[in-house]
Interface confidence: low
């Protein structure tokens, strides 16, 4: 428990002289003052310092209607000037004034630091009437004072459109130090200096700061608030806090964890979302970021094929979203995929590898050695070709698509034929004589139609003679 460092200020009595009902006469009028109409400062005796004249904020009323009698000057009586107390204590203070009975509707308002206190404050005004004057006592009470109650309080009274203002009563609420700035959690690079700041205020001042690291004090001697602690560098996570001390006791800040930036943990849960013939869409769950934001990630792709050279394709991507579409892959192939991410410290290890496959694709090469000739006797065109040569199939061959275009004297029409995968020959009927027939062939898989071969043209005469077209693409070794 923190004990009070000083006695509470005792409120002064409301009236230094007799109690209301036998109010002592104000003898100020005995001082020969040159009275004029309106208000002017008057000399009064401070009840707290008897015999010492002071110039208060007073009002000298006009002469009465009878013109025969001067009224005493109006001013709030002196009261306690400064109250010092601890937080959560109760306090009551007041101002008092004697007002001639000729004045009606006198109200007293309380002000704090220049702003009127309205509403739910505990202000009570009591009236003690006498033959000629009414003593008014305005009390203001605060239960369980807070720091926010600190300030300068005054009473104001309006008479004849003029304002009478009391001397200020200063309330100083003292308590344990209050933090205005506490150290913040940080992620720092290993063995690199950084600063922590701590600031606390009273009253009472001064406030002294001690720093604590992992439950041990860092500084032997306290530093006046505010304090900046320069930590030369850490190799392990540490918890820092600061202690603020004043005459009332000590307050401890929140403990903040200072983390050391590290390499990220590997991503987990790499998943396949969609596969096409030449792309795979993957996602992953990022690992622990090592207290440093991820910068980017690397998707590593290895082809799982005894014939492949085992090289790894690397695709760099942003760290977010945790998704990437791997492109430029071979159709109908198996791949092993891993993900690694980096922060400012370095790269994580690679995630557990997962297997994924691309789907069937359209063939990537056209049939070879396309040959076209006219079979006049049957009035048809004979087409021959060789199966496309490729190291790997994009998918299972299901057949061929033949395009033949007939052009003659401004007329052009294209026809398409489909033949089975076992064919390497087809016959199409002559559509138009005295015309050019252009033939192209493409291989077809379940994944789609491949590229068409280069066009091969043959002229179909009106009658009698044959035009033989060469192959479009020589097979390797036949050129």
């Amino acid at each position: 428990a923190i004990t009070e460092a000083r006695e509470e200020a005792k409120p002064y009595p409301l009236f230094p002289g007799p109690l209301p009902g036998s109010l002592q006469t104000d003898h100020t009028s005995l001082l020969s003052l040159p009275h004029t109409s309106g208000y002017q400062p008057a000399l009064m005796f401070s009840p707290t310092q008897p015999g010492r004249p002071y110039t208060g904020n007073v009002a000298i009323p006009r002469v009465t209607s009878a013109g025969s009698k001067l009224l005493p000057p109006l001013a709030f009586k002196h009261t306690v000037g400064h109250i010092i107390l601890s937080e959560h204590k109760d306090v009551k203070f007041n101002c008092s004034i004697s007002v001639p009975n000729i004045y009606q509707d006198t109200t007293i308002s309380w002000w704090k630091d220049g702003k009127e206190l309205l509403g739910a404050h505990h202000a009570i005004t009591q009236f003690y009437p006498d033959d000629e004057v009414t003593a008014i006592i305005a009390s203001f009470s605060i239960t369980s004072v807070q720091r926010s109650d600190n300030g300068s309080y005054i009473c104001k009274m309006k008479i004849n459109n003029e304002e009478i203002v009391s001397d200020p009563i200063y309330i100083e609420v003292q308590g344990l130090p209050h933090f205005t700035k506490q150290p913040e959690s940080m992620n720092v690079t290993r063995n690199t200096a950084f600063n922590l700041t701590c600031q606390a205020v009273g009253p009472p001042e001064p406030v002294n700061i001690f720093w604590v690291q992992n439950s041990s004090r860092v500084n032997e001697q306290p530093e006046k608030s505010p304090s900046v602690l320069t930590v030369p560098g850490l190799t392990e996570m540490a918890v820092f806090s600061c202690e603020a001390h004043n005459d009332k006791g000590l307050t401890v800040s929140k403990g903040v964890q200072i983390n050391i930036k590290a390499i990220p943990s590997p991503p987990t849960e790499v998943s396949i979302h969609n596969s096409t013939a030449h792309s795979i869409l993957i996602s992953w769950v990022p690992g622990f970021d090592g207290y440093s934001p991820f910068r980017n990630c690397s998707v590593q792709v290895k082809e799982v094929d005894p014939l492949s050279n085992g090289s790894v394709m690397i695709f760099n991507t942003s760290a977010s979203p945790h998704m990437y579409q791997i492109k430029q892959l071979q159709a109908l192939a198996n791949y092993s995929i891993g993900v690694s991410c980096m922060n400012e410290i370095g790269w994580s290890a690679v995630s557990p590898w997962i297997l994924a496959s691309t789907t069937e694709g359209a063939p990537s090469v056209a049939p070879l050695n396309v040959t076209v000739f006219l079979n006049e006797s049957r009035d048809n065109v004979d087409i021959r070709w060789m199966k496309p040569l490729t190291k790997r199939q994009a998918g299972e061959l299901v057949g061929y698509r033949i395009s033949h275009v007939w052009q003659s004297a401004g007329i052009s029409k294209e026809l398409l034929e489909e033949v089975g995968q076992n064919n390497s020959r087809a016959q199409i009927s002559v559509q138009v004589h005295n015309a050019t027939c252009t033939v192209r062939i493409a291989a077809v898989t379940k994944g789609g139609v491949g590229p068409f071969s280069d066009p091969v043209k043959i002229f179909i005469p009106a009658h009698g003679w044959v035009d033989h077209a060469p192959s479009s693409t020589p097979a390797p070794g036949n050129a």
């Epitope: 290993r190 063995n191 190799t235 392990e236 996570m237 983390n259 050391i260 590290a262 390499i263 943990s265 622990f288 207290y291 410290i345 370095g346 790269w347 290890a349």
Partner: antibody, heavy 120, light 108 residues
Framework: QVQLQQSGPELVKPGASVKLSCKAS????????INWVKQRPGLGLEWIGW????????KYNEKFKGKATLAVDTSSSTASMELHSLTSEDSAVYFC?????????????WGPGTTLTVSS | ENVLTQSPTTVAASPGEKITITCSAS???????LHWYQQKPGFSPKLLIY???NLASGVPARFSGSGSGTSYSLTIGTMEAEDAATYYC?????????FGAGTKLELK
Amino acid sequence: QVQLQQSGPELVKPGASVKLSCKASGYTFTTYDINWVKQRPGLGLEWIGWIYPRDGYTKYNEKFKGKATLAVDTSSSTASMELHSLTSEDSAVYFCARGYYDNLYYFDNWGPGTTLTVSS
Amino acid sequence: ENVLTQSPTTVAASPGEKITITCSASSIISSNYLHWYQQKPGFSPKLLIYRTSNLASGVPARFSGSGSGTSYSLTIGTMEAEDAATYYCQQGRSVPLTFGAGTKLELK
């Protein structure tokens, strides 16, 4: 692929010193700590200390201060540990291990170990 | 130092059996700092689980880890012959880094 290659077995006399080495490959050597761990036959694992190759910072288990000295040569990506004033108590397998520093410190790759026998 | 106590010291299990090994710390450690290793005779230890419950690369899904505060455990869902080894827990929260004394898992 991360690999830690350790020097071969050693047979040394009591009172002598010995230097064990650990060559790293397959990753950026300066990014991770190299730790040394002792295992005596039939007993558990004891952490000796770590060295951070980027700046040579070392952290020792109090128990091994004065017994072990850790060093690195970044040009060859090699870490070493010198053991002094050897006694039979130092006969053990010594592992080097890559440390995933710092706040969640674990050893994600280990060397095969070097067997040290101290005998007269 | 943070002393890790493993139990049991030795356990024998048949293939298909479920095994649980516990690790108790003398001081509280966050789950981020507790890791498990597997060591087979004549070999170096191998990271099995990091940060209490994350499987290291290539570790079969039959292994799992859990725990918090001072109490942690490693579970093998269905024991296989290749799982016969010594298992160590390790804390990375405070220096000196410490290991448990190990639990030897034998095949029945």
